[in-house]
């Protein structure tokens, strides 16, 4: 025998109090799959959360965070404070990155500057709290007498003007 509740579509529930009739989900509730015996309560985006997507009869509300915060956890279950670039969030608030580290985002941790010498390269642009160093050519490429980084222009034959 087929379960009569299996015919109830998403957005409804199988109402045992009414001979297993498919009843619409009440306000502020939803069912995202068919055959449900209850509807789930919609998530409410309160306080530091704001509504990204309203609840419907077939899908839950989705929240994100108010400006100055960013989402953490599955389905944005938490909002964490933003910091400025060049800082990281510690257990005592936002702190500047230590010398030799950087953070180019408003979230996450300070990361060490790239060590150019590990790749046999030189530092082209120094790092800051907000930006990583930029590695350039290897020191050998910059030493006197080394071949030029750009190839020389081709020689023109005498007596010929450029086209």
């Amino acid at each position: 025998l087929q379960d009569p509740c299996s015919n109830c579509p998403a957005g409804t529930f199988c109402d045992n109090n009414r001979n297993q009739i498919c009843s619409p989900c009440p306000p502020n509730s939803f069912s995202s799959a068919g055959g449900q015996r209850t509807c789930d309560i919609c998530r409410q985006c309160k306080g530091v959360f704001r509504t990204r997507k309203e609840c419907s009869s077939t899908s839950n509300a989705e929240c994100d965070c108010t400006p100055g915060f960013h989402c953490l956890g599955a389905g944005c279950s938490m909002c964490e404070q933003d910091c400025k670039q060049g800082q990281e969030l510690t257990k005592k608030g936002c702190k500047d990155c230590c010398f030799g580290t950087f953070n180019d985002q408003k979230r996450g941790i300070c990361r060490p500057w790239t060590n150019c010498s590990l790749d046999g390269k030189s530092v082209l642009v120094n790092g800051t709290k907000e930006r990583d160093v930029v590695c350039g050519p290897s020191p050998a490429d910059l030493s006197p007498g080394a071949s030029s980084v750009t190839p020389p222009a081709p020689a023109r034959e005498p007596g010929h003007s450029p086209q």
Partner: nanobody
Framework: EVQLLESGGGLVQPGGSLRLSCAAS????????MSWFRQPPETGLKWVSS????????YYADSVKGRFTISRDNSKNTLYLQMNSLRAEDTAVYYC?????????????????WGQGTTVTVSS
Amino acid sequence: EVQLLESGGGLVQPGGSLRLSCAASGFTFSNYAMSWFRQPPETGLKWVSSIDGSGGDTYYADSVKGRFTISRDNSKNTLYLQMNSLRAEDTAVYYCAKEGSHGTDDSHYDVDVWGQGTTVTVSS
């Protein structure tokens, strides 16, 4: 799969006590520092307390020092937060978290796994 499951939240009167638990699975529990965080209704996530892998070192936010006690039972893979002298401002969703490194007062939030949270409401 690494999982954290909190329990023990509920409604309590000001001055009352609650004990939160966090059951861990999927990793070698004793190898990692663990933390409690909370998110009050109107503000962002705040660190509450941390404990190192052995349970020897504990750290607390100033707002809970002397009232909350973090502990762990490595034989049961469980983290605890004993909360005494509760105040209205302790109302929040409480999350346990696995830290990627040793947690100290001003270390960054080096958290790689969060629980789903348990709600604590302090009201008369």
